[in-house]
C-alpha cells in the first residue's frame, strides 16, 4: 500500500468480467477494515475500473485460480489508492490487501 486510504467495496457487482481481460486481483478483507470480503479484479486496460466480486461465487474462484498460476506481471499493479476501485461509496478503511498472483503456481 502507498499509505493512502482505501474506499471499501460495499456491494458486489452483478456483472462478470471475462477472464482474458483481467490482469490481476486483490483481496478486500473485513479484518482489515471493510465490511464485506471481496475480490477486486483489475482489468488489463488501466483506464477501466476494478470490478468488485463475491469470493464465494464459482466464477470468481475459477478466475482467481487461473490468475494464481499465471506468472506475475513484470510491472506491479498500483496499490491502494483513492482513485482506484469500484464502487466509490465514501467509506474509508484500510481493507486493501494486494494479492497479485504471488502464490505458487498450482497448474497441472
Amino acid at each position: 500500500s502507498d499509505g493512502g486510504a482505501q474506499d471499501c467495496c460495499l456491494k458486489y457487482s452483478q456483472r462478470k468480467i471475462p477472464a482474458k481481460v483481467v490482469r490481476s486481483y486483490r483481496k478486500q478483507e473485513p479484518s482489515l477494515g471493510c465490511s464485506i470480503p471481496a475480490i477486486l479484479f483489475l482489468p488489463r486496460k488501466r483506464s477501466q475500473a476494478e470490478l468488485c466480486a463475491d469470493p464465494k461465487e464459482l466464477w470468481v474462484q475459477q478466475l482467481m485460480q487461473h490468475l494464481d498460476k499465471t506468472p506475475t506481471p513484470r510491472k506491479p499493479v498500483q496499490g491502494c489508492r483513492k482513485d482506484r476501485g469500484v464502487p466509490k461509496n465514501g467509506k474509508k478503511g484500510k481493507g486493501c490487501k494486494r494479492t497479485e498472483q504471488s502464490q505458487t503456481p498450482k497448474g497441472p
Epitope: K16, P18, A19, K20, K56, E57, L58, W59, Q61, Q62, L63, Q65, H66, K69, K106, G107, P108
Partner: antibody
Amino acid sequence: EVQLLESGGGLVQPGGSLRLSCAASGFTFNSYSMSWVRQAPGKGLEWVSAISMEGYSKSYADSVKGRFTISRDNSKNTLYLQMNSLRAEDTAVYYCARGYGYYFDVWGQGTLVTVSS
Amino acid sequence: SYELTQPLSVSVALGQTARITCGGDSIGSQYASWYQQKPGQAPVLVIYDDNERPSGIPERFSGSNSGNTATLTISRAQAGDEADYYCGSWDSNPTHVFGGGTKLTVLG
C-alpha cells in the same frame, strides 16, 4: 495419489431418483471446485453441473436444471449428485471431475446410470 | 445455448501432423481445454488454457485459440494417439460446454 471414486449408479425406472457420490482423496478437497460430467453410451461428453469450493455457488446444464442437485460435504471429502425425475436420456456414465481454473485436471473412472423400465 | 463444433473424424498418417478444430462463437475470448479419451477409459486433460500442457503430456501436443476456432495440433502422430478428443470451454454463467468429439485415426 490424487483420486476420485464415483459410486451410486445402477438401474432405475423413469421418474425415479438416484444419488451419486464421489469420494475424493489425495488432495485438499475444499480448495477445488468440482463438476459432474456424463457420457451416454456411444456419445460424447456432456457437462452436467459444477459447485464452488464451499458449496455456496452451483451451476447446471439446461438439460438437468430443476431435476438434479449438486452438493458437497467437505468434512467427508465427498461430492454428491441427487438425480430426480430421471428420464431415459439420462442414461450415461457419470464422471466426477476436479476443476482448476477453466479446466478439469482429475477425473474419476465413472459410474453407470441406466434409466429403463 | 453455446455450442462447440468439432469434425466427427480426422485421419493422419503415422508420423505426420494432425489438427483438430473446435468452432464456437468467439471461443477465442474464452479459455479452451482439450481432453483425450480412449475406449473404456476416463478422459485425460491434454491441453488447458488454450496452449498449456499438463506434466506428462508429450510436447507433440499443442493448442491455439483465436477468433472462432480453437485448434489441437498433434505432431509426429503415433499409434497410441488414436482416441476421441474433446474440446471444452466455460462461459461466464458459468456453464461448461464440450464439443461433440473427434475420433482421431492414425494410419499406417
